[in-house]
């Protein structure tokens, strides 16, 4: 807090310029008109003020706009944005994608800060849904953004926005998130032909049900092992040996290296050893010949 003192004669700022770096903090407080500052915020971003001087300027804006800054000021905050608290940002109404981009640019190269998280939350809530342009912007700055959302939040993503998603944007998504995203991706890419469809849908397959995996196995997709290992265990278990062989194509040989890891391990336990032997990979742990497999869950459902 800077003490309230009168501005010395001849020091009243007529514009925001480099001469202000020579003002002491109390002089900035006394001699810079807050309304002038608000209209010339873009200039602050070109002047090498110290952090302490920026604190004074922020204080002046806070006094001028106790209910929250207007978007015309927010768009030009630059570094001053990083001095805002989440509480400050919750008072804002940010509707322009240009404003969002300008503020994300300030934080570029850093982790998502609480300020940025609050800003994004305010922006998305204001828009009502995560439209394609917003998602494009957010994932460009923060590839992990999508996976930071809850399944409930992801449900507001329209299928058309899925086109903006890159494989690396899904790297940290868990199965619950992929369960929400997969049906949207399936809808978004439904008009593509077989091989093109598979390229686009591949990153989302961690949310695919058994019937979709069975359908893919009929299309010579040659799924790689990394993708297979990310599939839902409950979706993989009902697949037959023949279906997995078709699904993986030449990559089927990789099953041997993964036989102790889920979902391969659990899938092996559900297959007849005879069928596994047809792969010629030496996979062990299948159901021995002559054993009858009862699906108790099915039996319970019937009773």
């Amino acid at each position: 807090e800077v003490e309230k003192t009168a501005c010395p004669s001849g020091k009243k700022a007529r514009e925001i310029d480099e001469s202000l770096i020579f003002y002491k903090k109390w002089e900035l407080e006394a001699c810079v008109d807050a309304a002038l500052l608000a209209t010339q915020m873009d200039r602050v971003n070109a002047i090498p003020f110290t952090y302490e001087q920026l604190d004074v300027l922020k204080h002046k804006l806070d006094e001028l706009y106790p209910q929250g800054y207007p978007e015309s000021v927010i768009q030009h905050l630059g570094y001053l944005f990083l001095k805002m608290s989440p509480e400050d940002i919750r008072k804002w109404n940010v509707t322009s994608l240009e404003t969002l981009k300008a503020l994300l640019e300030v934080n570029k190269g850093h982790e998502m800060s609480p300020q940025v998280a609050t800003l994004i939350d305010r922006f998305v809530k204001g828009r009502g849904q995560l439209d394609k342009d917003t998602l494009d912007t957010l994932t460009a700055f923060y590839p992990g953004y999508l996976c930071s959302l809850s399944p409930e939040e992801l449900s507001s993503v329209p299928p058309s926005s899925i086109w903006a998603v890159r494989p690396q944007d899904l790297d940290t998504c868990d199965p619950r998130q992929l369960d929400v995203l997969y049906p949207k991706a399936r809808l978004a890419f439904q008009n593509m032909n077989g091989s093109e469809y598979f390229v686009k849908i591949q990153s989302f397959l961690g949310g695919a049900p058994t019937e979709d995996l069975k359908a893919l196995s009929q299309q010579n997709v040659s799924m790689d092992l990394a993708t297979f290992m990310k599939l839902r265990t409950d979706a993989v278990l009902p697949l037959t040996v023949a279906e997995v062989q078709k699904l993986l194509g030449p990559h089927v040989e990789g099953l041997k290296a993964e036989e102790r890891h889920r979902p391969v391990r659990d899938w092996i336990l559900r297959q007849r050893q005879d069928d596994l032997d047809t792969l010629g990979l030496g996979l062990q742990g299948g159901i021995p010949n002559g054993y009858l497999v009862l699906d108790l869950s099915m039996q319970e459902a019937l009773s």
């Epitope: 480099e18 070109a46 002047i47 090498p48 920026l54 905050l77 630059g78 570094y79 300008a102 300030v106």
Partner: nanobody
Framework: LQLVESGGGLVQPGGSLRLSCAAS????????IGWFRQAPGKEREGVSS????????NYADSVKGRFTVSRDNAKHTVYLQMNSLKPEDTAVYYC??????????MGQGTSVTVS
């Protein structure tokens, strides 16, 4: 973003020093730079500034005619040439940079003693 100042030291009244400000991990070329100083027990004060192109410079009244700010973008360095030094110039000198989107960088300072 970190700036590194150097060139400080002990000098007699009337003597000269040249301070340097360089960037660590990025390039200063598109950064406007301000030089500040802080004497013991006093508020930090602005000394001079230079635009990113070097075409515009400003000075505090107390150093006008004695200090000169310049930049060598080929060496990614900004200089503060201090002549006719006085005991009241004794302080820790800092450089502050501002780049695209108002991104800031500041150094740890270099100490100047005029005695």
């Amino acid at each position: 973003l970190q700036l590194v100042e150097s060139g400080g030291g002990l000098v007699q009244p009337g003597g000269s020093l040249r301070l340097s400000c360089a960037a660590s991990g990025f390039t200063l070329d598109n950064y406007a730079i301000g030089w500040f100083r802080q004497a013991p027990g006093k508020e930090r004060e602005g000394v001079s500034s230079i635009s990113s192109s070097g075409g515009s410079t400003n000075y505090a009244d107390s150093v006008k005619g004695r200090f000169t700010v310049s930049r060598d973008n080929a060496k990614h360095t900004v200089y503060l040439q201090m002549n006719s030094l006085k005991p009241e110039d004794t302080a820790v000198y800092y450089c502050v940079g501002v780049g695209d989107y108002g991104r800031r960088a500041m150094g740890q300072g270099t100490s100047v003693t005029v005695s």
